[in-house]
């Protein structure tokens, strides 16, 4: 908090109940509960600041549109140039029509050699997906059992080498109260004994540490 | 007054290049497709080269195709031919040439003066 | 190409002679004819646009005429001024081609 104070110092107290008299007082009571905090902002401040906000995004949406427009329009410019025929004839135009037949068999050229270039990357990777579903399908998946773990075997599964390291370190801290624990420790591993016992749990902890 | 003047004429050996230049004046420049044609020792004419008006398509006869590139700069209102690998029988005087238009027929509707280019050994 | 070729390299006429020049195609040209004037001096004009319309300022004694192949200009009432070399040029396919011209002398 960066004055300091603490979360009730700043809570209003919850006004007194309004004297039943009127049905006002009953409406009052039930729309707006008095323990509730009230808030600083009108609802028509409320209406005008949504309506603020809708209009900022509204305006943000179209300038996005806008801005979408103007990058194709900039795009098109410059792959499609404005026809100029001030002062072409019926014989420039045909030789245009040509230049812009040639241009389009070119471009229809590139693009087959694109699609076919596609097609053979999309035949590539079906084929190496493929290989994956085979290879995935000669390892056998053991099947899992649910077992329980301790923290310590966690560690020691999931960091291998480095989780041993820890759990020296852990050991050598724990070491200290060893002695004076060492009474207590026996009752209660008695008393677990049983309670594993008498829940099953003794034959699944031997065969999860064998 | 429409006016056009061509400048860059010269003597040259074969195989040598040679930029022609053309100013125009008297009228709105960038509307209008321009063109240069040659007049031969012979006094044969022969069309050179069109640029459209905003220099985007050009046309040339086979004859000079891939050596000669003709060009424009709207801003300077100035009409260029450049001349590559030229040859004897490009020797000739150029001409500078608005062109027009109407229903499809198109046509040089003014000249300049002529810049005369010599290419001999 | 479409080849251009006029029936005459010269023409002898007086001043006052009505005077026609030809010019076929190789080929259908559908109207697309034009026709310069060149001076002595080496200037060019354009005279006939569209096989018979006249370009603006050129005198209304000039003419064309013709469809298809064949194509002819006319020019009544030869002046002194009208003693020069003619072109015809057809606008129908690329390469935009001209034929030789005919030098028009006075008698």
């Known amino acids: 908090m960066a004055d300091g104070s603490s979360d009730a110092a700043r809570e209003p107290r919850p006004a007194p109940a309004p004297i039943r008299r009127r049905s006002s007082n009953y409406r009052a009571y039930a729309t707006e509960p008095h323990a509730k905090k009230k808030s600083k902002i009108s609802a028509s401040r409320k209406l005008q600041l949504k309506t603020l906000l809708l209009q900022i995004a509204k305006q943000e949406l179209e300038r996005e549109a806008e801005e979408r427009r103007g990058e194709k329009g900039r795009a098109l410019s410059t792959r499609c140039q404005p026809l100029e025929l001030a002062g072409l004839g019926f014989a420039e135009l045909q030789d245009l029509c040509r230049q812009l037949h040639a241009r389009v068999d070119k471009v229809d050229e590139e693009r087959y050699d694109i699609e076919a270039k596609v097609t053979k990357n999309i035949t590539e990777i079906a084929d190496l997906t493929q290989k994956i579903f085979d290879l995935r399908g000669k390892f056998k998946r053991p099947t899992l059992r649910r077992v329980r773990i301790s923290a310590d075997a966690m560690m020691q599964a999931l960091l291998g080498a480095r989780a041993k390291e820890s759990l020296d370190l852990r050991a050598h801290l724990k070491q200290v109260k060893k002695e004076d624990t060492e009474k207590e420790n026996r009752e209660v591993g008695d008393w677990r004994k049983n309670i594993d016992a008498l829940s099953g749990m003794e034959g699944r902890k031997k065969k999860f540490e064998s | 007054e429409v006016q056009m003047v061509e400048s860059g004429g010269g003597l040259l050996k074969p195989g040598g290049s040679l930029k022609l230049s053309c100013a125009a004046s008297?009228?709105?420049?960038?509307?209008?497709?321009m063109s240069w044609v040659r007049q031969t020792p012979e006094k044969r004419l022969e069309w050179v080269a069109t640029i459209s008006s905003g220099g985007s398509y050009s046309y040339y006869p086979d004859s000079v195709k891939g050596r000669f590139t003709i060009s424009r700069d709207n801003a300077k209102n100035t009409l260029y031919l450049q001349m590559l690998s030229l040859r004897s029988e490009d020797t000739a005087m150029y001409y500078c040439?608005?062109?027009?238009?109407?229903?499809?027929?198109?046509?040089?509707?003014?000249w300049g003066q002529g810049s005369s280019v010599t290419v001999s050994s | 190409d479409i080849q251009m070729t006029q029936t005459s390299s010269s023409l002898s006429a007086s001043l006052g002679d009505r005077v026609t020049i030809s010019c076929r195609a190789s080929q259908d040209i559908t109207n697309y004819l034009n026709w310069y004037q060149q001076k002595p001096d080496g200037t060019i004009k354009l005279l006939i646009y569209y096989t018979s319309r006249i370009h603006s300022g050129v005198s209304s004694r000039f003419s064309g005429s013709g469809s298809g192949t064949d194509y002819s200009l006319t020019i009544s009432n030869l002046e002194q001024e009208d003693i020069a070399t003619y072109f015809c040029q057809q606008g129908n396919t690329i390469p935009l081609t001209f034929d030789t011209g005919t030098k028009l002398e006075l008698k």
């Open positions: 040439a608005r062109r027009d238009n109407y229903y499809g027929s198109s046509f040089m509707d003014y």
């Open positions: 008297g009228f709105t420049y960038s509307n209008y497709a």
